[in-house]
């Protein structure tokens, strides 16, 4: 009773579209498959950035895999032959690994790249990324921000850069049409007469870092004796109210501070009748039926009333 | 479509070099590994050099080894044939040649370019 | 080097009959063969793959059998624009060769 054994795949190896971190993991069929015709052969793919700790791991009958990889680390990948125990009638068959690994030879010192890079999504509307030159770094040296998310078929050069003392310091990004829930990869790499400039690869997701406008139309309105409702409208732009939460801070009579973070646009506020003075502000967030993360917007515009009875049905400034 | 268009064939001295380019179109060029095969004058084709998809596996047949380079350019979509040290012998049509990849087996040739003629000749 | 051998040069046929262009590989090369047309004038063209394998288009009358190392190739109605060229070739392991080709004439 021979002992069956099957091939590793070749030629397995991680090929660099110039999607700046986003790769395609390729491999050949093993040599002899041949003799499992009748047999759904797969691969058990382990890859992972070098220095994590854990290897993500699929399973699959395809001949190739696609994933982001951080590229200011190497990556390294390994892959075997799996025969189901279908195949053999017993137990599963694995063959001997393949490996492979790959990473970008870096140029220049780590402290010339790029420092404090910062990426904001105004209002899900306006991407700016900005940056400091890397440390030590002459006047001469000037910086290159490229992109790439799926759906663009190269990678793409920033055209409006935000600059000081003729240095690129930051990018203004055009419309980035249906550019959200996927990763989106970013390398801002450098030249310089006297020294090579290091590369910096940064990858995000533009919903959670999405830094909405304030909230607009504050008002006032009499509920009860002892309850006032402060209400606002969303901010204009193409956020969904349903994604956004709020903070709201209130001032009463110079004295008591009231924070308060809420999902709706509403908020019931009891009150004394000694209150003289009633002053609040808000701002939003995107919030976590939306995106995984985000940014404060600014504080909206005070909205006080002061000197009048608070028995008034509705106070706006 | 799908289509190969081969260029840089020429007259050339015994010793001398070439590059040939393939030019590919139609088809997600990084994703398939790519060959060169000859077709000598009296018709036989004969297997020349492979490079995988990535450009980290290549494969010569042992009457070029170290005289031809195979090499790819994914971002240009284009497959090189440096040759040098040429010999009467290696006068042919030069053809490109995608691998074709299917989930049980690889190395046959599934699209062909229309070739182009290199003749080593004093 | 696995040596491919075609023993037939030529073969002469008429239309509407059935041929077959055989194959011997040197050595055990599984299913590990595919078959190439090469009309006058025009580069090759791959019919079959893995021995048995019809490449995407080719009529069902173009099939192709073996294993190990006899290799057949089976026009079952031959039709008078398969003259041409016929080629096999191993894809087993390095270095891939092919046979010596077979021209297949029309009477």
């Known amino acids: 009773d021979t002992e069956i054994k099957v091939n590793p795949p070749q030629d397995f190896e991680i090929v660099d579209p110039g999607y700046l971190g986003y790769l395609y993991l390729q491999w050949q069929p093993p040599l002899s498959l041949d003799h499992f015709k009748e047999c759904t052969v797969e691969y058990e793919l382990k890859y992972r950035n070098i220095g994590s700790e854990t290897w993500k791991t699929i399973i699959t009958k395809n001949l190739h895999y696609k994933d982001g990889f951080d590229l200011n680390k190497g990556i390294e990948a390994k892959i075997h032959t799996l025969l189901p125990w279908q195949c053999t009638n017993g137990s599963e068959v694995q063959s001997s690994w393949a490996e492979t690994t790959y990473w970008i030879s870096p140029q220049g010192i780590p402290e010339t790249k790029v420092q404090d890079m910062d990426c904001v999504y105004y209002n899900w509307q306006y991407l700016l990324c900005s940056w400091k030159p890397g440390i030590g770094v002459l006047l001469d040296t000037n910086y290159n921000l490229f992109y790439w998310y799926e759906g663009l078929d190269h990678a793409l050069q920033c055209v409006d850069y935000i600059k000081a003392d003729g240095q690129n310091i930051g990018c203004r990004f055009p419309y980035l049409e249906a550019s959200d829930y996927k990763d989106f990869y970013i390398c801002v790499n450098g030249s310089s007469e006297n020294k090579p400039i290091r590369s910096s690869y940064f990858t995000f997701q533009l919903q959670n870092i999405v830094k909405p406008l304030p909230p607009v139309y504050l008002t006032f309105t009499r509920e009860s004796s002892c309850e006032i409702k402060l209400k606002w409208s969303i901010p204009l732009g193409p956020i969904p109210a349903r994604c956004f939460d709020y903070e709201i801070e209130i001032r009463e009579d110079d004295t008591t501070l009231v924070t308060a973070t809420v999902e709706n646009e509403t908020y019931t506020l009891k009150t004394t009748n000694e209150t003289r003075q009633l002053c609040f502000v808000v701002r939003s967030k995107v919030n976590i039926y939306c995106s995984d993360d985000g940014i404060w917007s600014e504080w909206s515009d005070k909205q006080c009333w002061e000197g009048e009875d608070l028995s008034k049905k509705t106070l706006l400034r | 479509e799908v289509q190969l268009v081969e260029s840089g064939g020429d007259l050339v001295r015994p010793g001398g070099s070439l590059q040939l380019s393939c030019a590919a179109s139609?088809?997600?060029?990084?994703?398939?590994?790519m060959s060169w095969v000859r077709q000598t004058p009296d018709r036989r084709l004969e297997w020349v050099a492979t490079?995988?998809?990535?450009?980290?596996?290549?494969y010569y047949a042992d009457s070029v080894k170290g005289r031809f380079t195979i090499s790819r350019d994914n971002a240009r979509n284009t497959l090189y044939l440096q040759m040098s040290s040429l010999k009467s012998e290696d006068t042919a049509m030069y053809y490109c040649?995608?691998?074709?990849?299917?989930?049980?087996?690889?190395?046959?040739?599934?699209?062909w370019g229309a070739g182009t003629t290199v003749t080593v000749s004093s | 080097d696995i040596v491919m051998t075609q023993s037939h040069k030529f073969i002469s046929t008429s239309v509407g009959d059935r041929v077959s262009i055989t194959c011997k590989a040197s050595?055990?090369?599984?299913?590990?063969v595919a078959w190439y047309q090469q009309i006058p004038g025009q580069s090759p063209k791959l019919l079959i793959y893995?021995?048995?394998y019809r490449s995407t288009g080719i009529p069902d009358r173009f099939t192709g059998s073996g294993s190990g190392t006899d290799f057949s190739f089976i026009i079952s109605s031959v039709q008078a624009e398969d003259l041409a060229l016929y080629y096999c070739?191993?894809?087993?392991?390095?270095?891939?060769?092919f046979g010596g080709g077979t021209t297949l004439d029309i009477k």
């Open positions: 040649a995608r691998q074709g990849t299917t989930a049980l087996a690889t190395r046959f040739f599934d699209v």
């Open positions: 893995s021995a048995s």
């Open positions: 490079v995988s998809s990535g450009g980290s596996y290549i």
């Open positions: 139609g088809f997600t060029f990084s994703r398939n590994g």
């Open positions: 050595q055990d090369v599984g299913t590990a």
């Open positions: 070739q191993h894809h087993y392991s390095a270095p891939w060769t």
